[in-house]
Amino acid sequence: FKVATPYSLYVCPEGQNVTLTCRLLGPVDKGHDVTFYKTWYRSSRGEVQTCSERRPIRNLTFQDLHLHHGGHQAANTSHDLAQRHGLESASDHHGNFSITMRNLTLLDSGLYCCLVVEIRHHHSEHRVHGAMELQVQTGKDAPSNCVVYPSSSQDSENITAA
């Protein structure tokens, strides 16, 4: 399986909400001994590998923001802890999973990573990640709403987020 990032860049005004999205692609083993662990974290474009370093998002670690379930089941993070920080991560039945960040500030700008771990008990873990950039802007040059830019593999036109 693979992880797709529909958008590689999100440009948002300060105070806006944004939902960063990843999508699980390809065949998903729904066997009894296969489970999926999904999470989000901030990172940097490291020299060795992008998304290797795991930094907190608004003081919440990737352990706090994880989703756990089998296959394409829906799931949510622990609501209380995340929502106190203006965050919520969620997953649906179609392989989409996302993190919503409310009331953006300039400090939220940076590289965000989604991580999916396919756990084949008795065999191994298979991990894949996706990366996307969030730019929070302020002042007269800031857009009125979030503007998202598709990843290079998709259409190059920018799409305004709903």
């Epitope: 009894h32 001994d33 489970t35 662990y37 060795v48 590998q49 290797s52 795991r54 990737f62 352990q63 994880h66 756990h68 089998g70 622990s78 991580l115 771990v117 756990i119 008990h121 008795h122 065999h123 191994s124 873990e125 991990r127």
Partner: antibody, heavy 117, light 107 residues
Framework: QVQLQESGPGLVKPSETLSLTCTVS????????WSWIRQPPGKGLEWIGY???????NHNPSLKSRVTISVDTSKSQFSLKLSSVTAADTAVYYC???????????WGQGTMVIVSS | EIVLTQSPATLSLSPGERATLSCRAS??????LAWYQQKPGQAPRLLIY???NRATGIPARFSGSGSGTDFTLTISSLEPEDFAVYYC?????????FGGGTKVEIK
């Protein structure tokens, strides 16, 4: 802050079953791997096995089928049973939280188990 | 199973010196390798994950490097509290395995 605490008898007779429990406090047991690791006196670390929150288990083939790991989410506890013990099973036994695609990030303080008649 | 071989078994150094510890895997573990520190009578503590990333709260004097089969943990300038045993651990597949450890002792 998640904390782990091992409990169980410190002395077990050869051929009997070693039973230990790990109590998880300060966080949920309903996620992650919950693992057992041991360390014979003066030696290195050996991974025994884990139970995943979903109930799936996995253990070190070197221990053959002597290992049983179970979880009681209502008590926030997981347990280890190691059958047919010998003196070679004498060790400090640790419980630990293991994060998928990460590492053992939280450990109990360990409990010494001696196998002797 | 994957065998991890650590060297040297013992490293005798003075505070302020640089420590270089090696871990070699019997087959490639990519960068899925962690390092732990263990002091007498205590549980191990996570230092490094994914070969080169410091865990939360770990001082910058600890650094990891390597990928594939050869890995290094470096302590740039030893502090008195750094004298301990260090273990590497792979997680590319099960069973999870640890190296035999390197003891860093005061010279």
């Amino acid at each position: 802050q998640v904390q782990l605490q091992e409990s169980g008898p410190g002395l077990v007779k050869p051929s009997e079953t070693l039973s230990l429990t790990c109590t998880v406090s300060g966080g949920s047991i309903s996620s992650y791997y919950w693992s057992w690791i041991r360390q014979p006196p003066g030696k290195g670390l050996e991974w025994i096995g884990y139970i995943y929150y979903s109930g799936s288990t996995n253990h070190n083939p070197s221990l053959k089928s002597r290992v049983t790991i179970s979880v009681d989410t209502s008590k926030s506890q997981f347990s280890l049973k190691l059958s047919s013990v010998t003196a070679a099973d004498t060790a400090v036994y640790y419980c630990a939280r293991d994060i998928p695609a990460f590492a053992f990030d939280i450990w109990g303080q360990g409990t010494m188990v001696i196998v002797s008649s | 199973e994957i065998v991890l071989t650590q060297s040297p078994a013992t490293l005798s150094l003075s505070p302020g010196e640089r420590a270089t510890l090696s871990c070699r895997a019997s087959q490639s573990v990519s960068y899925y390798l962690a390092w732990y520190q263990q002091k007498p009578g205590q549980a191990p503590r996570l230092l490094i994950y994914d070969a080169f990333n410091r865990a939360t709260g770990i001082p910058a004097r600890f650094s990891g490097s390597g990928s594939g089969t050869d890995f290094t943990l470096t302590i740039s300038s030893l502090e008195p509290e750094d004298f301990a045993v260090y273990y590497c651990q792979q997680r590319i597949n099960w069973p999870l395995t640890f190296g035999g450890g390197t003891k860093v002792e005061i010279k």
